[in-house]
Interface confidence: low
């Protein structure tokens, strides 16, 4: 039959070449001469010429050694034609399978593998996985089946069998207890991969196992006792640097110190922070210390790590004796801001209040007083008693100096310490209104027509406060009421000024007297320009000139 079973050819054949593999034969060769040919990759297409066929006999030939790792199988077609070129058979499938030889050693995927495991872990803990590949066939043969082993371990502490490797997966695990980073921070394993499932070619690589730090060492204060001097009232002042030693990995959470004040700081006066570079505890004042209240503080500081301890460890405690140094403190006004009600316009020399300061220092220091800021110059202060008196006219309506009825003054207290210190106080005078301003109309100049004139609405303003303001009353004086009429509109505090009789075009003075609820009267002269016009006018029209 015109059929060929799959042909197996070992790779790396020694020849001689051409090597006969199989013979193609058509039973049509009884009737006519047959010529054979092959086509396909490895024959007439790349890689061309690996295989050939003897045209007349049908022998399939191999022209060169094969490499399974390059091409593992060839699929060719065999053809049979008669002498005249006519096809006598359908194309026949020829499969050539290249069988494996153990011609490749295993290769590790890396020269050096790096893994890590925490110190103190239990046997059986997985560390890392190494991989070696072998190009040979691992499915039909053992040529590519790799077996892993550990050849050597350095250092050999605490003994030479700290790790094991799974022979088929390459997983490295801990086999013994006793991993201690502080003694051996890193192991170097020489690992082997051997093909033929351990009976063939061997290759080596290095597996570096880093022993990771676990927090199995507590930080310890060195020294444990400190003495410091701090001036009172200093905030953020560096009191002391506390130093610790820790055998764990520098700059790791197991090494980085966490400090805690565990005693002696009832007033929450101190804070402690870890210095990021040196790992020292920087003890600083959170609040100012008060020498007069307490001149010595004994603090107890405990140190742990950022990471929790992995086993029960003793906690180190440091003692810091802080001596508070006395400084001359400034007098303090009581209260710091004093509000006093006083009537505006009261006579010069009249008492306003007594405003004094207390000195925190223990010595009986003499305090003298003076005014630091008095924008209008309205007050005086007795340097010994702190008595504040009127020195000028208090004017509630003076907007340059008074805001929301309040006049603000800053006073100074100076002690006789060495050097002298100064404290300030704020005196807030609430000025009580007096009816010292009459109502004033706005605007004070108007323009009005002398025929069908529009009434003029003037706004009334009074600088005083209620009840010294509305309701207002209006009265025209000096014969102004002959031609003019004035009426107050109580709803919107306006006065309506109307022209009662015809006046010729000119400028007139209208004498308008306004009084407030407290009968404070104010006379205002309104300049009224009367124009020859009807109704509304802004400006008198030019007189008509005839042609």
């Amino acid at each position: 039959d015109w059929v060929v079973a799959p042909i197996s050819v070992p790779e790396n054949g020694k020849g001689p070449f051409p090597q006969r593999l199989n013979q193609l034969k058509s039973n049509k060769d009884r009737d006519t001469k047959i010529f054979y040919s092959i086509t396909g990759p490895g024959a007439d297409s790349p890689p061309e010429g690996v295989f050939a066929v003897e045209k007349e006999t049908g022998w399939l030939l191999l022209n060169k050694p094969l490499d399974r790792e390059e091409i593992a199988k060839y699929e060719l077609f065999g053809h049979a034609v008669s002498e005249n070129g006519a096809s006598v058979e359908d194309p026949m499938n020829i499969s050539i399978i290249v069988t494996d030889q153990n011609d490749h050693k295993p290769k590790f995927t890396q020269d050096t593998f790096r893994g890590s495991v925490l110190e103190g872990v239990l046997p059986g803990t997985s560390v890392m996985q190494v991989t070696a590949t072998d190009e040979d066939d691992a499915i039909h043969t053992y040529n590519g089946v790799v077996a892993y082993s550990i050849h050597s371990q350095e250092p050999k502490d605490p003994h030479d069998l700290m790790f094991t490797i799974h022979r088929s997966t390459g997983t490295i695990s801990v086999i013994s207890s006793g991993l201690d980073r502080e003694k051996v921070p890193e192991y170097t394993l020489t690992i082997q991969a051997t093909d033929m499932d351990g009976d063939g070619s061997t290759t080596t690589a290095v597996a570096v196992v880093e022993i990771l730090d676990a927090n199995d060492n507590a930080p310890v204060f060195d020294p444990q006792k400190y003495e410091s001097h701090v001036p009172e009232n200093a905030v953020g002042h560096e009191v002391q640097r506390l130093t610790v030693t820790d055998l764990d990995a520098p700059n790791s959470p197991a090494w980085r110190a966490t400090y805690l004040i565990v005693g002696g700081d009832d007033g929450d006066h101190f804070t402690i922070a870890t210095h990021p570079e040196s790992n020292q505890g920087i003890l600083t004042t959170r609040k100012g210390l008060d020498f007069e209240a307490k001149n010595q503080h004994t603090l107890y500081v405990e140190v742990t790590n950022e990471a929790p301890f992995v086993l029960k460890l003793p906690t180190s405690t440091a003692t810091i004796v802080v001596h508070v140094e006395d400084v001359n403190e400034a007098p303090v006004f009581v209260p710091p801001s004093k509000v006093v009600e006083v009537q505006e316009g009261i006579p010069t020399g009249e008492a306003v209040c007594v405003y004094t300061a207390k000195d925190p220092d223990k010595e009986n220091q003499k305090i003298s007083y003076r005014i630091l800021r008095d924008p209008a110059g309205w007050l005086a202060m007795d340097p010994d008693s702190g008595q504040v008196t009127v020195a000028g006219t208090l004017d509630r309506e003076d907007e340059r100096f008074v805001r929301n009825n309040i006049y603000e003054v800053m006073v100074l207290a100076v002690d006789n310490g060495s050097p002298p210190t100064t404290g300030t106080g704020t005196l807030l005078l609430t000025l009580i209104d007096v009816n010292d301003h009459g109502p004033v109309p706005e605007p004070r100049e108007i323009t009005i027509c002398n025929q069908s004139p529009e009434s003029q609405v003037l706004n009334i303003t009074d600088k005083d406060l209620s009840p010294h303001t509305s309701p207002f009353q209006a009265q025209l004086t000096d014969d102004s009421d002959i031609y003019w009429m004035a009426e107050v509109n109580e709803k919107d505090d306006t006065v309506v000024l109307s022209l009662k009789k015809f006046l010729k075009q000119d400028t007139y003075d209208v004498h308008l007297s306004l009084s407030d609820h407290g009968n404070k009267e104010q006379l205002t002269v309104i300049r009224a320009t009367v124009c020859d016009c009807h109704g509304h006018v802004e400006k008198c029209p030019d007189p008509w000139k005839g042609g």
């Epitope: 200093a234 905030v235 953020g236 002042h237 922070a273 210095h275 570079e277 040196s278 920087i282």
Partner: antibody, heavy 116, light 107 residues
Framework: QVQLVQSGAEVKKPGASVKVSCKAS????????MHWVRQAPGQGLEWIGN????????NYAQKFQGRVTLTVDKSSSTAYMELSSLRSEDTAVYYC?????????WGQGTLVTVSS | DIQMTQSPSSLSASVGDRVTITCKAS??????VSWYQQKPGKAPKSLIY???NRFTGVPSRFSGSGSGTDFTLTISSLQPEDFATYFC?????????FGQGTKVEIK
């Protein structure tokens, strides 16, 4: 990563004031102190003062006392150095630098030129 | 104020040379000394703190030593990128003070 970015160059007349800013990022701002150091053209480094970035308390070199003001704006993580009553010898590159005592990170510097 | 006197003020050296810069404090500063490197037109770079501790990322050829009043910065094998000016600084007491600088130039 830690960064200190300073404001741009300034040209000022004698007697005027200058305010240089230093914007910080990449670390917990309020734990640290910010130092200010200057360097006149072709000269060495000169420490001006420092400020605690949470409390705002300061230390100044005697030479600059009364003329320099160090401030901080925690909301924008920015430290400021203001130098008043400028004179020609204040012409220098002004640096901010992070640290408690020694300095681990520096700003890029701000050139302040004082000239009439 | 504590004076920091640096010497020499300048030196010429070749690549591969061992270079030593000294700094003398006018009074005891324990080990509160740092060293900085500055290149023209650039901000200083922190090299050493506590007299002998390298900042992270600083090459191991840089080393510092000393305590009390005498301090040394050593570059074990000078590299092309090491040509710069070096400053010592004391932070033992306010005001912090710097040495006047040592310029390391190419021979």
């Amino acid at each position: 990563q830690v960064q200190l970015v300073q404001s741009g160059a300034e040209v000022k007349k004698p007697g005027a004031s200058v305010k240089v800013s230093c914007k910080a990022s990449g670390f917990t701002f309020t734990s640290y102190w910010m130092h200010w150091v200057r360097q006149a053209p072709g000269q060495g480094l000169e420490w001006i003062g420092n400020i605690q970035l949470s409390y705002g308390n300061t230390n100044y070199a005697q030479k600059f006392q009364g003329r320099v003001t160090l401030t901080v704006d925690k909301s924008s993580s920015t430290a400021y150095m203001e130098l008043s009553s400028l004179r020609s010898e204040d012409t220098a590159v002004y640096y901010c630098a992070r640290g408690f005592s020694y300095f681990d990170y520096w700003g890029q510097g701000t050139l302040v030129t004082v000239s009439s | 104020d504590i004076q920091m006197t640096q010497s020499p003020s300048s030196l010429s050296a070749s690549v591969g040379d061992r270079v030593t810069i000294t700094c003398k404090a006018s009074q005891n500063v324990d080990t509160d000394v740092s060293w900085y490197q500055q290149k023209p037109g650039k901000a200083p770079k922190s090299l050493i703190y506590w007299a002998s501790n390298r900042f992270t990322g600083v090459p191991s050829r840089f080393s510092g030593s000393g305590s009390g009043t005498d301090f040394t910065l050593t570059i074990s094998s000078l590299q092309p990128e090491d040509f710069a000016t070096y400053f010592c600084e004391q932070y033992s007491s306010y005001p912090f003070t710097f040495g006047q600088g040592t310029k390391v130039e190419i021979k």
